[in-house]
């Protein structure tokens, strides 16, 4: 009998607290082999999947879920779970995102976090600097 | 059942160009990164290039032998992956398979391929 | 880019037997490897991912082994369907690379 898989992690970038119609972006890391991401809500009746799978480090895995333009409606819990070899992980603890105007935000744009897992890193899809025109994320209206 | 059936493969000129299609069945296609893969006749296996998911911002990459002459990209409206191929060289000669990765870069599902002939 | 080296292209053996096929990187690429089968005139089958890991269906006569650089791809009875070519790769970085293949042949 195979032990229980690792709990996922999440994470936001960049970060949790978000002006509205500013992007964000959560990030789901778990162990290598991961098959699947998924992405819930707090209540669990709504998710989004992903298949598309970086290689974080050398001992992870993990997977994007972008929001083009926040709004009041992104607001809530969040908590990510994956497959690995059919079975389903437990789920990561949860990620409270905020929606609110902060301090400056209308003088100083927001910049965009590196997609990158760190300088001492070769994740697999980070390793190019290239990239197809910046087109749209996953919007909030597709996310949930 | 995943299928993924490409075409567009033929017989051109070298310095023309060819757009390879991949119509994709069987799965969700729009969470998925997809990648071209060829084969030279008689020759091993070569990656050519992969596009990620919206979520990704459709970020692209390609293999040194076809980059700024090669561009990837989907359409996830009709689940179709496509390849344009420009300033084709003899070397480009190959069969190209349409490929869905697992796991980040494991090449899980495979089609059954175009053949595509560069010569004068 | 890494490169991956399979030492062998070709390998003459006997029903039976016992292969074991070697593949190296030039770098470490922390167990994102995947083993590949391609008979003659097929298209290739993923048979083991992230170094060990066994595909749905493949039979349990492969394994894989390995880590940091140095892979392995065994089979404990060689049986006529398993005559084709095995490929590597990693998928650790991109440009993704495979290793040239070796090729099995009966005896």
């Known amino acids: 009998q195979e032990g229980p898989l690792p709990r996922p992690s999440i994470s936001a970038e960049p970060g949790t607290v978000i002006p509205p119609g500013r992007p964000v972006t959560i990030v789901c890391r778990g162990p290598v082999g991961v098959d699947q991401f998924r992405l819930e809500r707090e209540d669990r009746s709504k998710f989004n999947d992903t298949k598309d799978v970086s290689q974080a480090s050398p001992s992870e895995s993990e997977a994007r879920f972008r929001i083009d333009s926040v709004s009041e409606g992104n607001a809530g819990h969040y908590r990510c779970l994956y497959v690995k070899s059919t079975r389903w992980s437990e789920h990561s603890d949860y990620l409270d995102l905020v929606v609110k105007e902060t301090s400056g935000d209308t003088d100083s744009p927001v910049t965009e976090p590196d997609s990158s897992a760190g300088p001492t890193q070769r994740p697999s899809d980070n390793s190019h600097n290239e990239h197809a025109p910046a087109s749209q994320g996953l919007s909030a209206e597709h996310l949930y | 059942e995943v299928q993924l059936v490409e075409t567009g493969g033929g017989l051109v000129q070298p310095k023309g160009s060819l757009k390879l299609s991949c119509a994709a069945s069987?799965?969700?296609?729009?969470?998925?990164?997809m990648n071209w893969v060829r084969q030279a006749p008689g020759k091993g296996l070569e990656w050519v290039a992969r596009?990620?998911?919206?979520?990704?911002?459709?970020?692209?990459y390609y293999a040194d032998s076809v980059k700024d002459r090669f561009t990837i990209s989907r359409d996830d409206s009709e689940s179709m992956l496509y390849l344009q191929m420009n300033n084709l060289k003899t070397e480009d000669t190959a069969m190209y398979y349409c490929?869905?990765?697992?796991?980040?870069?494991?090449?899980?599902?495979w089609g059954q391929g175009t053949s595509v002939t560069v010569s004068s | 880019d890494i490169q991956m080296t399979q030492s062998s292209s070709s390998f003459s053996v006997s029903l039976g037997d016992r292969v074991t096929i070697t593949c190296k990187a030039s770098e470490d690429i922390y167990n994102r490897l995947a083993w590949y089968q391609q008979k003659p005139g097929n298209v290739p089958r993923l048979l083991i991912s992230?170094?060990?890991s066994l595909e749905t269906g493949v039979p349990s006569r492969f394994s894989g082994s390995g880590s940091g650089k140095d892979y392995t791809l065994s089979l404990t009875s060689l049986q006529s369907e398993d005559v084709a070519t095995y490929y590597c790769?990693?998928?650790?970085?991109?440009?993704?690379?495979f290793g040239g293949g070796t090729k099995l042949e009966i005896k």
């Open positions: 490929v869905r990765d697992r796991y980040g870069g494991a090449m899980a599902y």
């Open positions: 069987g799965f969700t296609f729009n969470i998925n990164a």
């Open positions: 790769q990693q998928y650790w970085t991109i440009p993704y690379t």
């Open positions: 596009i990620r998911t919206k979520n990704n911002n459709y970020a692209t």
């Open positions: 992230s170094a060990t």
